[in-house]
């Protein structure tokens, strides 16, 4: 058993039929010695008396809020949560496996630049009685500070018969140099509690590996005189690290006909303009990627040819 | 300890081309190592990230763009003195800081070159003949060093009398390649910045 936060404890259980469970001793936080009784949750049934209560925790029915009272007055609470271990593996029932970039990916994180700011998100089908808390650091043995906000519900989607909920959190490394060469990864730890079930999820990464620039901005077409051609131009996204001559981007320019069957024409360039033959109903798209360290491409910025 | 904005003459900064080749060569070699050594811990997640230049050179700090010198987190107290000549400098107006930056890059390359050559000598003794260093990568390191044109004592190639442990050598190769790729990215960013200045 260990303390998650004040008056909240996690009991780690091997989860299999007829498992013996864990013996837990609860102590009432009071100077009082006599006339103390214990109850569980909203029940008025007295579970025991005395300053300590010994219980055998085997299943979710044994978890919950234990309260010690004296003469009708509440003295203290202890909330017991269960953390299940099945076949030596901690349960991952609360969050959905996003399977990207590999199986057992529950947390996904992205950074728009090298400032040390990043966003992580996760998915669940659970809609109520759900809380998350997020901690992060750079390295684990001698951790350096990373500050995370509160996790918030950022999107809801319908997937078949199920509703899916996306939660996200923003974190910022306390003293980040955009030009630094990372040797210790960022560690992100998410504690998830659903009713009386506790689970924890972790992710470890270098900022350089989770970079995904915003799409290029101000994508514009300028028709060229006496020609079917247009000059396409765009700019670095505002959120990208500066100076741009140091943090350079590569761009992918694509021309796509109206029909998905039409072959796309595309090219990669380090410049912020190109000349395109604009066909009716075609669209021109541009996306960006760090020029020197190939992490993710940005989403496309697109304009119609017409 | 930062790069000035008004640096080389217009026209192709001679080291940019070499640094682009360097990054391409290191990335290709790392990819080859990851494929060939698929049953060894050779991915970024599996290896320990070590920097053989740590406390010996200060490339990131010496080559910091002017715009980042206001960022407290980027300013490290380490000071290192280097020789200040070199043909990539391309202009008399080049400041001492830029010379410091380029000589730091040169020292990095020299250190990695020695490590890679020592490692290659060991890999050539491996009866499995599983992996060797790409000669193109070694040549590209050499070309960039020549373009930087700094004079410094040659570091003798390390020789070892004991029987090499090929498993450990291959893991060390992965560690070295990952670290060198990260440094090659920094070098490419620096050269691009100087070329645009």
């Amino acid at each position: 058993i260990w303390e998650l936060k004040k008056d909240v404890y996690v009991v780690e259980l091997d989860w299999y039929p007829d498992a013996p469970g864990e013996m837990v001793v609860l102590t009432c936080d009071t100077p009082e010695e006599d006339g103390i009784t214990w109850t569980l949750d909203q029940s008025s049934e007295v579970l025991g008396s005395g300053k300590t209560l010994t219980i055998q925790v085997k299943e979710f029915g044994d978890a919950g809020q234990y309260t010690c009272h004296k003469g009708g007055e509440v003295l203290s609470h202890s909330l017991l949560l269960l953390h299940k271990k099945e076949d030596g593996i901690w349960s991952t029932d609360i969050l959905k496996d996003q399977k990207e970039p590999k199986n057992k990916t529950f947390l996904r994180c992205e950074a728009k630049n090298y400032s040390g700011r990043f966003t992580c998100w996760w998915l669940t089908t659970i809609s109520t009685d759900l809380t998350f808390s997020v901690k992060s650091s750079r390295g684990s043995s001698d951790p350096q500070g990373v500050t995370c906000g509160a996790a918030t519900l950022s999107a809801e989607r319908v997937r078949g018969d199920n509703k899916e909920y996306e939660y996200s959190v923003e974190c910022q490394e306390d003293s980040a140099c955009p030009a630094a060469e990372e040797s210790l990864p960022i560690e992100v730890m998410v504690d998830a509690v659903h009713k009386l079930k506790y689970e924890n999820y972790t992710s470890s990464f270098f900022i350089r590996d989770i970079i995904k620039p915003d799409p290029p901005k101000n994508l514009q077409l300028k028709p060229l005189k006496n020609s079917r051609q247009v000059e396409v131009s765009w700019e670095y996204p505002d959120t990208w690290s500066t100076p741009h001559s140091y943090f350079s981007l590569t761009f992918c320019v694509q021309v796509q006909g109206k029909s998905k069957r039409e072959k796309k024409d595309r090219v990669f360039t380090d410049k912020t303009s190109a000349t395109v033959i604009c066909r009716k109903n075609a669209s021109i798209s541009v996306r960006a990627q760090d020029r020197y360290y190939s992490s993710s491409w940005s989403e496309w910025a697109s304009v119609p040819c017409s | 300890r930062n790069l000035p904005v008004a640096t080389p003459d217009p026209g192709m900064f001679p080291c940019l081309h070499h640094s682009q080749n360097l990054l391409r060569a290191v990335s290709n070699m790392l990819q080859k190592a990851r494929q060939t050594l698929e049953f060894y811990p050779c991915t970024s997640e599996e290896i320990d990230h070590e920097d053989i230049t740590k406390d010996k050179t200060s490339t990131v700090e010496a080559c910091l763009p002017l715009e980042l010198t206001k960022n407290e987190s980027c300013l490290n107290s380490r000071e290192t003195s280097f020789i200040t000549n070199g043909s990539c400098l391309a202009s008399r107006k080049t400041s001492f800081m830029m010379a410091l930056c380029l000589s730091s890059i040169y020292e990095d390359l020299k250190m990695y070159q020695v490590e890679f050559k020592t490692m290659n000598a060991k890999l050539l003794m491996d009866p499995k003949r599983q992996i060797f260093l790409d000669q193109n990568m070694l040549a590209v390191i050499d070309e960039l060093m020549q373009a930087l044109n700094f004079n410094s004592e040659t570091v003798p190639q390390k020789s070892s009398l004991e029987e090499p442990d090929f498993y450990k050598t291959k893991i060390k190769l992965c560690i070295l390649l990952h670290a060198f790729r990260i440094r090659a990215v920094t070098i490419d960013r620096v050269m691009s910045y100087l070329n645009a200045s």
Partner: nanobody, 126 residues
Framework: EVQLVESGGGLVQAGDSLRLSCAAS????????MGWFRQAPGKEREFVAY????????DHADSVKGRFTISRDNAKNTVYLQMNSLRPEDTAVYYC???????????????????WGQGTQVTVSS
């Protein structure tokens, strides 16, 4: 393997025009991004223009923009460089190059190109 042969170079007066051609062998021509580069004596080889595999996207170096135009004919396995308003500073050996699309090459960088022609000399006198 792609073989590239340039033609159309020569000696012209400033203000004149020239059209360079580059004929490629092989059936996979339409899977290559094509580029033109040039090298003046004692100088680095520099980017002039590129064109995408389908011929819809192109770009030119700032120094030639508005004067030179790159185009391709995939049916003829040929890429062209139309050079108008030529200047003495355009004097150089012009090279045609091919970069395999599958490698996702950055089209403005010479080292990203896999195959090169022998070059054709363009001399512009004042």
């Amino acid at each position: 393997e792609v073989q590239l042969v340039e033609s159309g170079g020569g000696l012209v007066q400033a203000g004149d025009s020239l059209r360079l051609s580059c004929a490629a062998s092989g059936r996979t021509f339409s899977t290559y991004v094509m580029g033109w580069f040039r090298q003046a004596p004692g100088k680095e080889r520099e980017f002039v223009a590129y064109i995408s595999t389908g011929g819809l996207i192109s770009d030119h170096a700032d120094s030639v923009k508005g004067r030179f135009t790159i185009s391709r004919d995939n049916a003829k396995n040929t890429v062209y460089l139309q050079m108008n308003s030529l200047r003495p500073e355009d004097t150089a050996v012009y090279y045609c190059a091919a970069a395999s699309r599958t490698r996702r090459p950055i089209a403005t960088i010479k080292d990203e190109y896999d195959y090169w022609g022998q070059g054709t000399q363009v001399t512009v006198s004042s």
